[in-house]
Interface confidence: low
């Protein structure tokens, strides 16, 4: 009753904060400056309220802190006098999702700020091309994602729905494989994975080039170009050339845009052009032998895109070799 002359109660405000799994976040809360500051951060679930962090009488009070928050929370102590009651929250887990309430009391008022913390995860997905016996498959895979993403496939820019989805992780984060059987198809395919909470999208695009027929000891040029629609100029990416043989992939060349370094794993392999413009990653394979027949895969990948280009090379015996036999 004594306090009522000085004390006003301000209703609750609400804010949404989106964090990423394993990263740190600040849950914001501000108040009008006053003396005798008391701060209580609490987490509310369907059944209970848990103490996250408390401050009163000029220092942090962690005696009643719930163990799940031990060594993971702190306030900006030097800024409390300026009206900053924000909570610094380390190493987010999906279990941290939910409603956080910040109660701030001063000599003249009390406020309650409500922060809804949503935690998302989106580890860079991959697009893989696999051959199993006589069948060919495209797999869009995301190792860790939350909440469930939207996965869409397109064939020649037309949406298609017939894909086989596998998901692990019942509560999240989820690991998701979406597989498409592309046996015998010459179409181009695109897979998009979107996490709408984090507003993050990844796209994988697969293109099969026309088969190349070459003679023994000739050279072959394998095209692979970066499409500007997909990659922004300052985006880091990597280029991997590999060969598919009996379902196993062996790397032939590797390029990193950040360092502009190329590593060749096959001496007969070289770039078609100098990589000055960093957009044409076509390759030359010289001195062809019969055993060079097969599928060659160019993979250009960034955090947001994967472009896969497949070439089928058929090497035939040269006339001299044929007449020798």
């Amino acid at each position: 009753i004594f306090l009522s002359a000085f004390f006003t109660y301000v209703p609750m405000n609400e804010q949404i904060i989106i964090g990423r799994l394993g990263e740190d976040i600040i849950l914001p809360s501000s108040f009008e400056r006053g003396s005798e500051v008391v701060i209580h951060w609490k987490y509310q679930d369907s059944y209970n309220s848990y103490n996250v962090h408390s401050y009163y009488k000029g220092s942090g009070r962690l005696e009643s802190q719930d163990t799940r928050y031990a060594n993971r929370t702190s306030l900006f102590y030097n800024e409390i006098q300026n009206g900053n009651a924000s909570l610094f929250f380390r190493r987010l887990s999906l279990l941290d999702e939910g409603i956080y309430t910040c109660y701030v009391g001063t000599a003249i008022q009390a406020i309650t700020n409500k922060v809804v913390l949503k935690v998302g995860v989106f580890l860079t997905p991959m697009m893989k091309y696999e051959k199993r016996n006589t069948n060919s498959f495209l797999i869009c895979n995301v190792l860790s994602v939350y909440p469930r993403p939207i996965i869409t496939w397109k064939m020649d820019n037309t949406p298609i729905s017939e894909n086989n989805m596998q998901e692990t992780g019942s509560l999240g984060p989820f690991s998701i494989n979406s597989t498409l059987n592309i046996t015998g198809s010459n179409s181009s395919y695109e897979c998009t994975i979107e996490n709408s909470l984090l507003k993050q999208t990844w796209t994988g695009r697969w293109t099969m080039k026309d088969g190349l027929h070459k003679m023994q000891s000739e050279h072959v040029s394998l095209s692979c170009e970066l499409v500007n629609d997909y990659f922004s100029p300052n985006q880091d990416f990597k280029v991997t050339w590999s060969r598919m043989e009996s379902g196993i992939s062996s790397i032939l060349a590797y390029y990193l845009s950040s360092s502009q370094n190329t590593t060749f794993y096959e001496s007969r392999f070289s770039w078609n052009k100098e990589l000055k413009n960093q957009s044409d990653f076509s390759m030359n394979l010289t001195d062809l032998s019969l055993s060079d027949s097969g599928e060659y895969l160019c993979n250009i990948s960034s955090d947001e895109y994967t472009l896969l280009t497949i070439h089928t090379v058929h090497v035939e015996p040269s006339q001299e070799t044929a007449s020798d036999n």
Epitope: I16, G98, V116, I150, S196, K199
Partner: antibody, heavy 120, light 107 residues
């Protein structure tokens, strides 16, 4: 197919209350954010409120904050809008709309709307 | 809150015309913009999302472009069925907002 059916509209006096409902079917209701959007006669669209898929968060347009309350019952596939202290400027067709996904996005599906008239 | 300014508010055009509607955001919204078509007495219909992606079933004469703060909706060849009102909507922030609308009427 997805269906959203609003009900509860009508004529009400200024200062009184009204409760709108939206019955959803044809999709997993608990996976999607739900919104109320209104349109005054002859005017444009105005977003009113959202409730997240799991009910943990509600956001309101400044024009209705403190007067309107959005709620949902995921077991019954229903969305409600409790409107208190109604004003003449709240007169509009109220649409319920389904978010594209679980977070704030665009609206793929809309109800047919229910008319609320605030008049003395 | 992010404000969306649409122009023009009314547009008179003929069948076969190329029509462009502009939407400007008060701050950058990346590509988080949708376009809707609405006919009198009906609910809005989604045309474009993520600034330029065409919603399934929407005719290809509709296209969207832009990012950041400037966006456009283009109808390449206006058809009789296209006379309607059009709205942009941002969903970059967690309070969505619509533009004021553009009414496309017969000249």
């Amino acid at each position: 197919q997805v269906q959203l059916v609003e009900s509860g509209g009508g004529v009400v006096q200024p200062g009184r209350s009204l409760r709108l409902s939206c019955a959803a079917s044809g999709f997993t209701f608990s996976n999607y954010g739900m919104h109320w959007v209104r349109q005054a006669p002859g005017k444009g669209l105005e977003w009113v409120a959202v409730i997240w898929y799991d009910g943990t968060n509600k956001n309101y347009a400044d024009s209705v904050k403190g007067r309107f309350t959005i709620s949902r019952d995921n077991s019954k596939n229903t969305l409600d809008l409790q409107m208190n202290s109604l004003r003449a400027e709240d007169t509009a067709v109220y649409f319920c709309a389904r978010d594209r996904n679980t977070a704030m996005d665009y609206f793929v599906y809309w109800g047919q709307g229910t008319l609320v008239t605030v008049s003395s | 809150d992010i404000q969306m300014t649409q122009s023009p508010s009314t547009l008179s055009a003929s069948v076969g015309d190329r029509v462009t509607i502009t939407c400007r955001a008060s701050q950058s919204i990346s590509s988080w913009l949708a376009w809707y078509q609405q006919k009198p007495g009906k609910a809005p219909k989604l045309l474009i999302y993520k600034a330029s992606s065409l919603e399934s079933g929407v005719p290809s004469r509709f296209s969207g472009s832009g990012s950041g703060t400037e966006f456009t909706l283009t109808i390449s060849s206006l058809q009789p069925d296209d006379f309607a009102s059009y709205y942009c909507q941002q969903y970059n922030s967690y309070s969505v907002t619509f533009g004021g609308g553009t009414k496309v009427e017969i000249k």
